[in-house]
């Protein structure tokens, strides 16, 4: 046993060594030799004991969805899709894996989180990290310059996720994007309107949408004295301001990233500010910031954006926040992020954010990265963080001890006596053919009590009971599970009666 443990330890160590050599880009010969050693060590472990030791689980950062969780998910998706469609979006789908080259250089520091697929001797492939880069690739490949689309699919990130907070390595994204050359800020405002509509419809609590602009950030860094090469890394520090204090962010910028303390202080004066359109106007008057072309453009667009947001009736949900510096490299203009707010402990306190539930922004340069001639297609979009929303909805339903139906069955075809299986089969078939969602128990002679109990557990509202007398009279006994009230319905009227009671349209066109 000790020998096996030692061998397992060596396999682990050798695996780490191989990974390390690959990361260090060691010589192919050395990697090949160390991989061969790893395989020999694994072979010595032998297959039999390792089978017994195999723990049945999903891979790290993934989960199964139970019927109950799926019911929650379907409801959330339904709200989102209805909103996307209401705004005139088409739907597309793209492969779950892309050429590695497609994804490279699009995510900055986050590139290390991309899952590479093991080389199968052909193309170098990676699992998609988001839906935006594949969308840009799709536009460039099909030479599209104009589309409004949504895409709901799983994406993959080699993160160390806190799954309790709704963070995973495989998770859904729900994206809505508008591509095309349009007048400034109209599509951007619609994206923010969609975000607010969805978050309001989901009833997951009060939320705030933080808005900023990449150009304002870049302009601000420039006037504060940050060199171009440090823009992105300082951005990632600033973006932590929603989680940690300014002091900690400053320490990181000065201590770890080599920024001069006075430069950090100048940045601090700006990034700790947040407000509404009045802050935009105040910054337009800022003697230094207003002299920077990029920042001035960004502020001008934000002023216009706030006008449209007011017309859309959502300006009260929006906060101009100079610390918002979303991590992805491809944003070029407006950026935004929706956070849920915890109710403050004391009245008058600042509302406290509990994590991003939606985000997005403008990325005018991404499609051009794929175009041989570098032709740009301006794009703006949003992504709903549905995994976090699923978690919140699930927790809320658990707290309320609310029963969630996991099927849509409208009626159970039951019998009160024995030897009526054939009649039940005939009736259930008639109901299916008429578009009724119906079930029966898979027993020849089920007890009536068991059938009624099944309805209660599954939340099935109606039971169609066949008995010998009913057959003679040409009726079916229709029973309401909750009220226990029973009525005889002529067989030819049964479909219509079930539809009437369950609020289903009478034609299934």
């Amino acid at each position: 046993m000790a020998e096996r443990a030692a061998l397992e330890e060596l396999v682990k160590l050798q695996g780490e060594r191989v990974r390390g050599l690959k990361q260090q880009k060691a010589s192919a010969e050395l990697i090949e030799e160390e991989v061969a050693k790893l395989l020999k060590l694994k072979a010595q472990l032998g297959p039999d004991e390792s089978k017994q030791k195999f723990v049945l689980k999903t891979p790290k950062g993934t989960r199964d969805y139970s019927p109950r969780q799926m019911a929650v998910r379907e409801k959330v998706f339904d709200v989102i899709i209805r909103c996307f469609k209401r705004h005139g979006a088409e739907v597309i789908d793209t492969p779950v894996f892309e050429l590695k080259e497609t994804l490279m250089g699009k995510y900055g520091e986050d590139s290390k989180l991309i899952y590479d697929l093991k080389d199968q001797g052909g193309e170098l492939l990676s699992l998609r990290y988001d839906l935006t880069v594949p969308f840009a690739r799709y536009l460039a490949m099909n030479k599209l310059t104009n589309i409004k689309r949504y895409h709901i699919a799983k994406v993959y990130r080699r993160d160390n996720p806190a799954m309790t907070r709704g963070r995973y390595r495989e998770f859904y994204q729900c994206d809505f994007d508008i591509a095309g050359n349009f007048d400034p800020m109209i599509p951007d405002a619609e994206c923010l309107k969609i975000m607010c509509e969805i978050l309001s419809s989901l009833q997951i609590g009060d939320f705030l949408v933080k808005v900023n602009d990449r150009r304002i950030l870049d302009g601000m860094f420039a006037i504060c004295g940050v060199s171009d090469s440090k823009f992105r890394t300082i951005c990632s520090s600033v973006d932590k301001l929603d989680k940690v204090s300014w002091e900690e962010v400053k320490n990181e910028m000065v201590g770890e990233k080599g920024l001069a303390p006075e430069v950090a202080d100048r940045i601090g004066d700006y990034v700790q500010q947040h407000g509404g359109v009045s802050l935009v106007e105040q910054l337009l008057q800022d003697p230094k910031l207003s002299q920077n072309k990029q920042a001035l453009e960004g502020l001008g667009d934000l002023k216009l954006l706030f006008e449209y947001l007011t017309l859309f009736g959502i300006d009260d949900k929006i906060s101009f926040d100079l610390s918002l510096a979303r991590g992805l490299d491809y944003y070029t203009g407006v950026i935004y992020e929706a956070v849920l707010l915890q109710t403050p402990a004391q009245a008058g306190e600042e509302p406290l954010g509990v994590g991003s539930v939606a985000a997005g922004g403008r990325y005018d340069g991404l499609v051009g990265m794929f175009d041989p001639k570098g032709r740009k297609v301006p794009c703006v979009g949003l992504s709903i963080g549905v995994e976090r929303i699923f978690s919140i909805v699930e927790q809320r339903l658990e707290a309320l001890e609310e029963k969630i139906r996991t099927t849509e069955t409208q009626v159970l075809v039951a019998s009160a006596q024995k030897k009526l299986l054939e009649e039940r089969l005939k009736l259930v078939s008639e109901l299916w053919d008429a578009g009724i969602k119906a079930e029966l128990l898979y027993k020849k002679n089920p007890k009536l009590l068991n059938q009624l109990q099944y309805c209660e557990e599954a939340g099935i509202p109606l039971v169609a009971i066949i008995g010998e007398q009913e057959l003679k009279d040409g009726v079916i006994k229709l029973r309401s599970v909750t009220s226990r009230e029973e009525v005889d319905v002529r067989r030819e009227d049964l479909v219509e009666e079930i539809k009437r009671r369950t609020g289903q349209p009478l034609c299934i066109c």
Epitope: L10, K40, Q44
Partner: antibody, heavy 120, light 107 residues
Framework: QVQLVESGGGLVKPGGSLRLSCAAS????????MTWIRQAPGKGLEWVSY????????NYADKVKGRFTISRDNAKNSLYLQMNSLRDEDTAVYFC?????????????WGQGTLVTVSS | DIQMTQSPSSVSASVGDRVTITCRAS??????LAWYQQKPGRAPKLLIF???SLQSGVPSRFSGSGSGTHFTLTISSLQPEDFATYYC?????????FGQGTKLEIK
Amino acid sequence: QVQLVESGGGLVKPGGSLRLSCAASGFTFSDYYMTWIRQAPGKGLEWVSYISGSFRYTNYADKVKGRFTISRDNAKNSLYLQMNSLRDEDTAVYFCARYVYQVVAIGDLWGQGTLVTVSS
Amino acid sequence: DIQMTQSPSSVSASVGDRVTITCRASQGISSWLAWYQQKPGRAPKLLIFAASSLQSGVPSRFSGSGSGTHFTLTISSLQPEDFATYYCQQAESFPYTFGQGTKLEIK
């Protein structure tokens, strides 16, 4: 029984050559990486060279690179070290050893050693 | 090359004593470390590999610990046959190197 036995050591003049052999028995020789390790009189241990079970991988300490050649004959369960252009500092007891768990660069089975003396 | 430094270079102890020998690597070697015992005129004998795994047939009074750059070999209760020279060796990267040795003598 499981053992390694070295031979071929002796007195040789600087610039001379010598071929050491190591006979293995009691285990599947071809499965194992094998190595030569030496120890100068009254001194510590020094890794000289290794060879994989399939002959595919070999490596040498910088001090002996270009002068020593490691080889093996799996059919004869034998390991060899061809030493050319010998120097005074090559004087040592030469041990052959087997890698632990076939591929881990730690000697779990050693021969008794063979003394090589380089002197004019 | 990775340098291995053992301390002390010699230690005197009595039967029944607990003895600890330390080995430091000039750079991180994870757990790729072995300990050997060598008696005069004999080949080294493997005691510990992978920093803490006891080689089959080695008495349990020998134990190893550590990872990264700092490692120790402990003999919990010295026996007469334990008086010898002890070497550590890194197996992280070629050339695999040994410590200079620690001579354990009878007090």
